[in-house]
Protein backbone atom coordinates (compact mmCIF):
# COMPACT_ATOMS: atom_id res chain seq x y z
CA UNK A 1 0.00 0.00 0.00
CA UNK A 2 1.37 3.41 -0.89
CA UNK A 3 -0.01 6.93 -0.79
CA UNK A 4 1.09 9.83 -2.96
CA UNK A 5 -0.25 13.25 -2.21
CA UNK A 6 -0.13 16.55 -3.97
CA UNK A 7 0.63 19.29 -4.40
CA UNK A 8 3.43 19.84 -1.90
CA UNK A 9 2.60 23.50 -1.65
CA UNK A 10 -0.66 25.24 -2.46
CA UNK A 11 -1.25 28.97 -2.21
CA UNK A 12 -4.78 30.25 -2.80
CA UNK A 13 -6.78 33.37 -2.18
CA UNK A 14 -9.45 33.49 0.50
CA UNK A 15 -12.89 32.72 -0.94
CA UNK A 16 -11.52 30.67 -3.82
CA UNK A 17 -11.19 26.89 -4.10
CA UNK A 18 -8.37 24.53 -3.08
CA UNK A 19 -8.01 20.96 -4.33
CA UNK A 20 -5.80 18.39 -2.59
CA UNK A 21 -5.31 15.03 -4.26
CA UNK A 22 -4.36 11.71 -2.70
CA UNK A 23 -3.47 8.72 -4.86
CA UNK A 24 -3.78 5.37 -3.11
CA UNK A 25 -1.92 2.57 -4.86
CA UNK A 26 -2.79 -0.91 -3.67
CA UNK A 27 -1.32 -3.82 -5.57
CA UNK A 28 -3.92 -6.20 -4.17
CA UNK A 29 -7.69 -6.32 -3.94
CA UNK A 30 -9.31 -4.82 -0.88
CA UNK A 31 -12.79 -5.19 0.46
CA UNK A 32 -12.75 -1.89 2.28
CA UNK A 33 -10.27 0.96 2.38
CA UNK A 34 -10.15 3.40 5.27
CA UNK A 35 -8.85 6.85 4.42
CA UNK A 36 -8.16 9.82 6.61
CA UNK A 37 -7.36 13.49 6.08
CA UNK A 38 -5.67 15.39 8.87
CA UNK A 39 -4.89 19.09 9.21
CA UNK A 40 -2.07 20.03 11.56
CA UNK A 41 -2.37 16.58 13.12
CA UNK A 42 -6.11 16.80 13.83
CA UNK A 43 -8.49 14.43 12.05
CA UNK A 44 -10.79 16.13 9.55
CA UNK A 45 -12.53 12.94 8.44
CA UNK A 46 -11.94 9.22 8.15
CA UNK A 47 -14.38 7.66 5.72
CA UNK A 48 -14.42 4.19 4.17
CA UNK A 49 -14.38 3.31 0.52
CA UNK A 50 -16.37 0.18 -0.22
CA UNK A 51 -17.21 -1.05 -3.72
CA UNK A 52 -15.95 2.23 -5.13
CA UNK A 53 -18.15 4.48 -3.02
CA UNK A 54 -17.33 6.77 -0.11
CA UNK A 55 -19.08 6.39 3.23
CA UNK A 56 -19.27 10.18 3.57
CA UNK A 57 -18.84 13.19 1.33
CA UNK A 58 -17.90 15.95 3.74
CA UNK A 59 -14.52 16.46 5.32
CA UNK A 60 -14.01 19.26 7.80
CA UNK A 61 -15.38 22.79 7.35
CA UNK A 62 -16.25 23.49 3.70
CA UNK A 63 -14.50 20.27 2.70
CA UNK A 64 -15.94 17.90 0.10
CA UNK A 65 -14.57 14.45 -0.66
CA UNK A 66 -14.72 12.52 -3.89
CA UNK A 67 -13.32 9.18 -4.98
CA UNK A 68 -12.37 8.44 -8.55
CA UNK A 69 -11.70 4.74 -9.10
CA UNK A 70 -9.31 3.11 -9.02
CA UNK A 71 -7.11 5.25 -6.82
CA UNK A 72 -7.81 8.98 -6.56
CA UNK A 73 -9.20 10.63 -3.45
CA UNK A 74 -9.83 14.37 -3.72
CA UNK A 75 -10.41 16.87 -0.94
CA UNK A 76 -11.92 20.09 -2.22
CA UNK A 77 -12.14 23.14 0.05
CA UNK A 78 -14.64 25.66 -1.22
CA UNK A 79 -14.83 28.45 -0.27
CA UNK A 80 -11.41 28.64 1.33
CA UNK A 81 -11.07 30.66 4.52
CA UNK A 82 -7.96 31.84 6.37
CA UNK A 83 -8.55 29.05 8.91
CA UNK A 84 -7.89 26.47 6.20
CA UNK A 85 -4.18 27.35 6.20
CA UNK A 86 -2.12 24.45 7.51
CA UNK A 87 -0.42 21.14 6.86
CA UNK A 88 -2.65 18.45 5.33
CA UNK A 89 -1.84 14.73 5.31
CA UNK A 90 -3.68 11.90 3.58
CA UNK A 91 -3.55 8.44 5.19
CA UNK A 92 -4.96 5.13 4.00
CA UNK A 93 -5.31 1.65 5.44
CA UNK A 94 -6.59 -1.78 4.53
CA UNK A 95 -7.73 -3.24 7.86
CA UNK A 96 -8.46 -6.88 7.13
CA UNK A 97 -7.27 -9.54 7.03
CA UNK A 98 -4.13 -7.71 8.09
CA UNK A 99 -3.56 -4.03 8.80
CA UNK A 100 -1.62 -2.26 6.06
CA UNK A 101 -1.28 1.50 6.32
CA UNK A 102 0.50 4.31 4.53
CA UNK A 103 0.46 8.09 4.48
CA UNK A 104 1.35 10.77 2.01
CA UNK A 105 3.73 13.67 2.34
CA UNK A 106 2.45 16.96 3.69
CA UNK A 107 0.54 19.40 1.53
CA UNK A 108 1.08 22.91 2.93
CA UNK A 109 -1.85 25.17 2.22
CA UNK A 110 -1.39 28.94 2.45
CA UNK A 111 -4.48 31.10 2.20
CA UNK A 112 -3.99 34.74 1.25
CA UNK A 113 -6.58 37.17 2.56
CA UNK A 114 -8.82 38.96 0.11
CA UNK A 115 -7.64 42.28 1.54
CA UNK A 116 -4.01 42.85 0.48
CA UNK A 117 -3.38 45.17 3.46
CA UNK A 118 -4.40 42.31 5.74
CA UNK A 119 -1.80 40.21 3.97
CA UNK A 120 0.91 42.86 4.57
CA UNK A 121 0.06 43.02 8.25
CA UNK A 122 0.17 39.24 8.51
CA UNK A 123 3.60 39.03 6.89
CA UNK A 124 4.89 41.87 9.06
CA UNK A 125 3.80 40.00 12.16
CA UNK A 126 6.36 37.27 11.56
CA UNK A 127 9.70 37.88 13.29
CA UNK A 128 12.97 38.16 11.41
Amino acid sequence: LSVQQGPNLLQVRQGSQATLVCQVDQATAWERLRVKWTKDGAILCQPYITNGSLSLGVCGPQGRLSWQAPSHLTLQLDPVSLNHSGAYVCWAAVEIPELEEAEGNITRLFVDPDDPTQNRNRIASFPG
Epitope: T28, A29, R34, Y48, E95, I96, L99
Partner: antibody, heavy 120, light 112 residues
Framework: EVQLVESGGGLVKPGGSLRLSCAAS????????MSWVRQAPGKGLEWVSS???????YSPDSVKGRFTISRDNAKNSLYLQMNSLRAEDTAVYYC??????????????WGQGTLVTVSS | DIVMTQSPLSLPVTPGEPASISCRSG???????????LHWYLQKPGQSPQLLIY???NRFSGVPDRFSGSGSGTDFTLKISRVEAEDVGVYYC?????????FGGGTKVEIK
Protein backbone atom coordinates in the same frame (compact mmCIF):
# COMPACT_ATOMS: atom_id res chain seq x y z
CA GLU B 1 -0.76 -9.22 31.73
CA VAL B 2 -3.51 -9.04 29.12
CA GLN B 3 -6.96 -9.51 30.60
CA LEU B 4 -10.33 -9.63 28.87
CA VAL B 5 -13.40 -9.96 31.06
CA GLU B 6 -16.83 -10.42 29.46
CA SER B 7 -20.13 -9.63 31.13
CA GLY B 8 -23.78 -9.12 30.25
CA GLY B 9 -24.75 -12.66 29.30
CA GLY B 10 -27.91 -14.30 30.58
CA LEU B 11 -31.29 -15.73 29.67
CA VAL B 12 -33.37 -13.83 27.14
CA LYS B 13 -36.53 -14.61 25.19
CA PRO B 14 -36.52 -14.97 21.40
CA GLY B 15 -36.77 -11.54 19.79
CA GLY B 16 -35.21 -9.93 22.84
CA SER B 17 -32.04 -7.88 23.22
CA LEU B 18 -28.85 -8.12 25.23
CA ARG B 19 -25.70 -6.03 25.46
CA LEU B 20 -22.41 -7.76 26.13
CA SER B 21 -19.38 -5.91 27.49
CA CYS B 22 -15.70 -6.77 27.55
CA ALA B 23 -13.40 -4.94 29.94
CA ALA B 24 -9.81 -4.95 28.72
CA SER B 25 -6.65 -4.32 30.72
CA UNK B 26 -2.91 -4.89 30.53
CA UNK B 27 -2.40 -3.42 27.06
CA UNK B 28 -3.04 -0.29 24.99
CA UNK B 29 -6.63 -1.05 24.03
CA UNK B 30 -6.86 1.51 21.21
CA UNK B 31 -3.95 -0.12 19.34
CA UNK B 32 -5.68 -3.44 18.74
CA UNK B 33 -8.53 -4.76 16.67
CA MET B 34 -11.10 -6.53 18.84
CA SER B 35 -13.58 -9.29 18.05
CA TRP B 36 -16.40 -11.44 19.34
CA VAL B 37 -16.36 -15.19 18.71
CA ARG B 38 -19.07 -17.55 19.92
CA GLN B 39 -19.36 -21.23 20.70
CA ALA B 40 -22.73 -22.98 20.89
CA PRO B 41 -22.93 -25.65 23.63
CA GLY B 42 -20.86 -28.68 22.59
CA LYS B 43 -20.10 -27.13 19.20
CA GLY B 44 -17.25 -25.41 17.41
CA LEU B 45 -16.20 -21.76 17.11
CA GLU B 46 -17.98 -19.13 15.03
CA TRP B 47 -16.79 -15.61 14.26
CA VAL B 48 -19.40 -13.00 15.21
CA SER B 49 -17.95 -9.54 14.68
CA SER B 50 -14.77 -7.47 14.63
CA UNK B 51 -13.87 -3.82 15.02
CA UNK B 52 -10.61 -2.29 13.87
CA UNK B 53 -8.45 0.20 15.73
CA UNK B 54 -10.10 2.95 13.71
CA UNK B 55 -13.63 1.75 14.35
CA UNK B 56 -14.30 -0.12 11.11
CA UNK B 57 -16.70 -2.99 11.71
CA TYR B 58 -16.85 -6.39 10.02
CA SER B 59 -19.46 -9.12 10.51
CA PRO B 60 -20.84 -12.21 8.78
CA ASP B 61 -24.26 -11.94 7.13
CA SER B 62 -25.76 -14.17 9.83
CA VAL B 63 -25.62 -11.32 12.37
CA LYS B 64 -25.61 -8.21 10.15
CA GLY B 65 -28.48 -5.92 10.99
CA ARG B 66 -29.03 -7.67 14.33
CA PHE B 67 -25.71 -7.38 16.15
CA THR B 68 -23.64 -4.21 16.48
CA ILE B 69 -20.06 -4.16 17.70
CA SER B 70 -18.62 -0.98 19.20
CA ARG B 71 -15.72 0.16 21.33
CA ASP B 72 -14.96 2.89 23.83
CA ASN B 73 -11.21 3.45 23.88
CA ALA B 74 -11.49 5.85 26.81
CA LYS B 75 -13.07 3.10 28.90
CA ASN B 76 -10.97 0.24 27.46
CA SER B 77 -14.20 -1.52 26.64
CA LEU B 78 -15.68 -3.55 23.80
CA TYR B 79 -19.43 -4.04 23.35
CA LEU B 80 -21.81 -6.24 21.41
CA GLN B 81 -25.40 -5.06 21.13
CA MET B 82 -27.54 -8.07 20.21
CA ASN B 83 -31.09 -7.49 18.97
CA SER B 84 -33.76 -9.81 17.54
CA LEU B 85 -32.15 -12.76 19.29
CA ARG B 86 -32.89 -16.28 18.09
CA ALA B 87 -32.54 -19.70 19.70
CA GLU B 88 -29.54 -20.37 17.44
CA ASP B 89 -27.70 -17.42 19.01
CA THR B 90 -27.42 -19.44 22.24
CA ALA B 91 -23.68 -19.75 22.91
CA VAL B 92 -20.74 -18.74 25.02
CA TYR B 93 -19.54 -15.39 23.64
CA TYR B 94 -15.81 -14.74 23.80
CA CYS B 95 -14.12 -11.37 23.55
CA UNK B 96 -10.85 -11.71 21.64
CA UNK B 97 -7.97 -9.38 20.85
CA UNK B 98 -6.04 -9.22 17.61
CA UNK B 99 -2.70 -10.96 18.02
CA UNK B 100 -0.75 -7.76 17.43
CA UNK B 101 -1.16 -4.29 15.92
CA UNK B 102 -1.19 -5.66 12.38
CA UNK B 103 -2.85 -9.00 13.06
CA UNK B 104 -6.47 -7.95 12.95
CA UNK B 105 -8.01 -11.29 11.96
CA UNK B 106 -6.27 -13.82 14.20
CA UNK B 107 -6.85 -13.78 17.91
CA UNK B 108 -3.99 -13.86 20.40
CA UNK B 109 -5.92 -13.33 23.62
CA TRP B 110 -9.36 -14.54 24.67
CA GLY B 111 -11.64 -13.80 27.60
CA GLN B 112 -13.28 -16.51 29.68
CA GLY B 113 -16.59 -16.06 27.86
CA THR B 114 -20.13 -15.15 28.88
CA LEU B 115 -23.11 -17.46 28.27
CA VAL B 116 -26.10 -16.18 26.32
CA THR B 117 -29.19 -18.38 26.38
CA VAL B 118 -32.11 -17.56 24.09
CA SER B 119 -35.17 -19.49 25.15
CA SER B 120 -38.85 -18.94 25.83
CA ASP C 1 -18.73 -19.20 3.01
CA ILE C 2 -15.46 -21.11 3.03
CA VAL C 3 -15.92 -24.59 4.52
CA MET C 4 -12.98 -25.80 6.60
CA THR C 5 -12.78 -29.58 6.94
CA GLN C 6 -10.58 -31.13 9.60
CA SER C 7 -9.46 -34.72 9.95
CA PRO C 8 -9.45 -36.82 11.93
CA LEU C 9 -12.36 -35.84 14.16
CA SER C 10 -10.70 -37.64 17.06
CA LEU C 11 -7.03 -38.43 17.56
CA PRO C 12 -5.87 -40.73 20.36
CA VAL C 13 -2.17 -40.09 21.00
CA THR C 14 0.66 -41.56 23.03
CA PRO C 15 2.82 -39.10 25.00
CA GLY C 16 6.22 -38.69 23.34
CA GLU C 17 4.86 -39.73 19.92
CA PRO C 18 4.20 -37.35 17.02
CA ALA C 19 0.72 -36.30 15.94
CA SER C 20 -0.68 -34.67 12.84
CA ILE C 21 -3.96 -32.91 12.06
CA SER C 22 -5.18 -32.05 8.56
CA CYS C 23 -7.27 -29.06 7.51
CA ARG C 24 -8.73 -28.54 4.05
CA SER C 25 -10.48 -25.45 2.75
CA GLY C 26 -13.22 -25.28 0.14
CA UNK C 27 -11.16 -22.85 -1.91
CA UNK C 28 -7.66 -21.43 -1.97
CA UNK C 29 -6.68 -19.38 1.07
CA UNK C 30 -4.03 -17.40 -0.79
CA UNK C 31 -5.03 -13.75 -0.45
CA UNK C 32 -4.48 -11.29 -3.29
CA UNK C 33 -1.66 -9.84 -1.17
CA UNK C 34 0.11 -13.25 -1.47
CA UNK C 35 -0.30 -14.10 2.22
CA UNK C 36 -2.25 -17.13 3.40
CA UNK C 37 -4.44 -16.49 6.41
CA LEU C 38 -4.74 -19.95 7.93
CA HIS C 39 -4.47 -20.22 11.70
CA TRP C 40 -4.57 -22.92 14.38
CA TYR C 41 -6.14 -22.70 17.85
CA LEU C 42 -6.24 -25.11 20.78
CA GLN C 43 -9.08 -25.23 23.27
CA LYS C 44 -8.04 -27.17 26.34
CA PRO C 45 -10.81 -28.80 28.40
CA GLY C 46 -12.82 -26.16 30.29
CA GLN C 47 -10.72 -23.30 28.90
CA SER C 48 -10.98 -20.59 26.28
CA PRO C 49 -9.27 -21.12 22.91
CA GLN C 50 -5.63 -20.10 22.51
CA LEU C 51 -3.71 -19.21 19.39
CA LEU C 52 -0.97 -21.64 18.39
CA ILE C 53 -0.06 -20.83 14.78
CA TYR C 54 -0.93 -17.91 12.52
CA UNK C 55 -0.52 -17.47 8.78
CA UNK C 56 0.18 -21.17 8.17
CA UNK C 57 3.49 -21.56 9.97
CA ASN C 58 4.18 -18.75 12.44
CA ARG C 59 4.22 -19.84 16.08
CA PHE C 60 2.50 -17.38 18.38
CA SER C 61 4.52 -16.07 21.33
CA GLY C 62 4.93 -18.61 24.11
CA VAL C 63 3.93 -21.58 21.97
CA PRO C 64 6.39 -24.50 22.34
CA ASP C 65 8.45 -25.36 19.28
CA ARG C 66 7.03 -28.89 19.20
CA PHE C 67 4.08 -27.30 17.36
CA SER C 68 4.53 -26.54 13.68
CA GLY C 69 2.27 -25.63 10.81
CA SER C 70 2.64 -26.18 7.10
CA GLY C 71 0.70 -26.30 3.87
CA SER C 72 -0.48 -24.09 1.02
CA GLY C 73 -3.49 -23.35 -1.11
CA THR C 74 -6.22 -25.56 0.30
CA ASP C 75 -4.29 -28.21 2.27
CA PHE C 76 -2.75 -27.53 5.67
CA THR C 77 -1.25 -29.55 8.50
CA LEU C 78 -0.57 -29.00 12.18
CA LYS C 79 2.14 -31.25 13.59
CA ILE C 80 3.12 -31.94 17.18
CA SER C 81 6.59 -33.47 17.17
CA ARG C 82 6.28 -35.10 20.62
CA VAL C 83 2.88 -35.00 22.28
CA GLU C 84 2.73 -34.04 25.94
CA ALA C 85 -0.15 -34.65 28.33
CA GLU C 86 -0.92 -30.90 28.40
CA ASP C 87 -1.59 -30.90 24.64
CA VAL C 88 -4.99 -32.57 24.99
CA GLY C 89 -8.01 -30.62 23.84
CA VAL C 90 -9.80 -29.62 20.65
CA TYR C 91 -7.71 -28.15 17.82
CA TYR C 92 -9.36 -25.78 15.35
CA CYS C 93 -8.08 -24.47 12.06
CA UNK C 94 -9.41 -21.10 10.93
CA UNK C 95 -9.24 -18.98 7.81
CA UNK C 96 -9.44 -15.19 7.57
CA UNK C 97 -8.55 -14.78 3.91
CA UNK C 98 -12.21 -14.56 2.95
CA UNK C 99 -15.09 -12.87 4.77
CA UNK C 100 -16.81 -14.39 6.67
CA UNK C 101 -13.93 -15.83 8.62
CA UNK C 102 -14.60 -19.47 9.37
CA PHE C 103 -13.37 -22.28 11.61
CA GLY C 104 -13.00 -25.99 11.10
CA GLY C 105 -15.18 -28.36 13.12
CA GLY C 106 -12.33 -29.30 15.42
CA THR C 107 -10.13 -32.30 16.12
CA LYS C 108 -10.23 -33.77 19.61
CA VAL C 109 -6.80 -34.91 20.77
CA GLU C 110 -6.80 -37.26 23.75
CA ILE C 111 -4.26 -39.47 25.45
CA LYS C 112 -4.57 -43.18 24.68
Amino acid sequence: EVQLVESGGGLVKPGGSLRLSCAASGFTFSSYAMSWVRQAPGKGLEWVSSISQGGGTYSPDSVKGRFTISRDNAKNSLYLQMNSLRAEDTAVYYCARGADYYGTSWFGNWGQGTLVTVSS
Amino acid sequence: DIVMTQSPLSLPVTPGEPASISCRSGQSLVHSNANTYLHWYLQKPGQSPQLLIYKVSNRFSGVPDRFSGSGSGTDFTLKISRVEAEDVGVYYCSQSTHVPWTFGGGTKVEIK
